[in-house]
Interface confidence: low
């Protein structure tokens, strides 16, 4: 049996850096939406009520605890009418798989904050990107967040050659050694080992030797 | 210099819930540190139970987790240990531990440098 | 999980002489999160070693730590009467945090 008409299907969580929008098919006829999402306390409670879009912003919701495991479903009315129900005495509704920000939110491309070069080492610092994850009024971090579970890998290579060399941090920052008077190139990625999904960023964009963020002091 | 004090009841009535709270005194909960709680048993071993960052992020030793509740009052600067249903195999000494990350030559180190004294939990009706 | 086995359960040295402690990781640990602690009777652990070789703040340069891998050792070059005491390694890189069940130096 085929998916009812005006049922979602194919509930997917597109989420990084726990910015997290809850995308499904089709696009409706006929019919609106209204999403629910389970909170800690197994209660549904209602967001992007009678929308004609298939997406939804969750974010406000799962940033409340991110280590909660989160499950929401996607319910479909008639147009004009959102007291409609199914055969059953239900709207139609489809669950989304479930959702654990912490360990499945996708690590955002890092940003390459400055690089500075004294005598043979360079010390280069990536961008602590403020995610959406509030305590007491304040934005977290993704260190706030993730803490010693997040490690950046530096990928660093001369300009003038193609060999890359790898380090890597469990701060913002790498301290290498490099070869005097010689300019190199970095890239950086995030990377979470514990995870089983999800685990790297995509590289940052490549920042070289000789370029604005860097700084030369002998 | 950041000291820790454990407090909470020194005895538990079987299938009841434990409580202990750690306070931390000397410096901020909030400084990028890890807190855990770790146990040993009369005579025994170091068992680590679980940790918690001041974020909220929480780790539990899996043979613990279904019982462990860790949290964090960054107001106070105290966090807490909640173990359920206890037995008499929860009698320990209970410790709470600072998990310090130390940077080093582009590396991190963790240990736990600062320890309380323990408090003594007996599970006993 | 990492299982932690030291050896042996117990030293018996005389003040003066060489202790010698291993402990032996079911998998291999990253050093940076090795450490090794010391326990005295009715006392909380403290402290020596961490990053299986740097010895923490105030720790007598008697005590020292090496190893990588699966094989840690700690080693006291010269007995003093305050190390007769239980030490402990653990490793913090991996959940569920791991101690070894120590081993414990005591008097001749």
């Known amino acids: 049996a085929g998916t009812p008409p005006g049922k979602a299907f194919n509930l997917t969580w597109i989420s990084t850096d726990f910015k997290t929008i809850l995308e499904w098919q089709p696009k409706p006829t006929n019919y609106t939406y209204t999403v629910q999402i389970s909170d800690r306390s197994r209660n549904w409670k209602y967001k992007c009520t009678g929308t004609t879009d298939t997406e939804c912003d969750l974010t406000d919701e799962i940033v409340k605890d991110v280590n909660w495991t989160y499950e929401a479903r996607v319910l479909s009315y008639p147009a004009g009418n959102v007291e409609s129900t199914g055969s059953a005495g239900e709207p139609l509704y489809e669950n989304s798989p479930e959702f654990t920000p912490y360990l499945e939110t996708n690590l955002g491309q890092p940003t390459i904050q400055s690089f500075e070069q004294v005598g043979t080492k360079v010390n280069v610092t990536v961008e602590d990107e403020r995610t959406l994850v509030r305590r007491n009024n304040t934005f977290l971090s993704l260190r706030d967040v993730f803490g010693k579970d997040l490690i950046y890998t530096l990928y660093y290579w001369k300009s003038s050659s193609s060999g890359k060399k790898t380090a890597k941090t469990n701060t913002n920052e790498f301290l290498i050694d490099v070869d005097k008077g010689e300019n190199y190139c970095f890239s950086v990625q995030a990377v979470i080992p514990s995870r089983t999904v999800n685990r790297k960023s995509t590289d940052s964009p490549v920042e070289c030797m000789g370029q604005e963020k860097g700084e030369f002091r002998e | 210099q950041v000291q820790l004090q454990e407090s909470g009841p020194g005895l538990v009535k079987p299938s009841q819930t434990l409580s202990l709270t750690c306070t931390v005194s000397?410096?901020?909960?909030?400084?990028?540190?890890?807190w855990s709680w770790i146990r040993q048993h009369p005579g025994k071993g170091l068992e680590w139970i679980g940790e918690?960052?001041?974020?909220?992020?929480?780790r539990y030793n899996p043979s613990l987790k279904s019982r462990v509740t860790i949290s964090v009052d960054t107001s106070k600067n105290q966090f807490s240990l909640k173990l359920s249903s206890v037995t008499a195999a929860d009698t320990a000494v209970y410790y709470c531990?600072?998990?310090?990350?130390?940077?080093?030559?582009?590396?991190?180190?963790?240990?736990?440098?600062?320890w309380g004294k323990g408090t003594t939990v007996t599970v006993s009706s | 999980e990492i299982v932690l086995t030291q050896s042996p359960g117990t030293l018996s040295l005389s003040p003066g002489e060489r202790a010698t402690l291993s402990c032996r990781a079911s998998?291999?640990?990253?050093?940076?999160?090795l450490a090794w602690y010391q326990q005295k009777p009715g006392q909380a652990p403290r402290l020596l070693i961490y990053?299986?070789?740097s010895r923490a703040t105030g720790i007598p340069d008697r005590f020292s730590g090496s190893g990588s891998g699966t094989d840690f050792t700690l080693t006291i070059s010269r007995l003093e009467p305050e190390d007769f005491a239980v030490y402990y390694c653990?490793?913090?890189?991996?959940?569920?945090?791991?101690f070894g069940g120590g081993t414990k130096v005591e008097i001749k």
């Open positions: 531990a600072r998990d310090t990350p130390y940077y080093y030559d582009g590396g991190y180190y963790y240990y736990m440098d600062v």
């Open positions: 000397g410096g901020s909960i909030s400084s990028g540190q890890y």
């Open positions: 918690i960052y001041y974020s909220g992020s929480t």
């Open positions: 998998q291999s640990v990253s050093s940076s999160y």
């Open positions: 990053g299986a070789s």
């Open positions: 653990q490793q913090v890189g991996v959940v569920p945090y791991t």
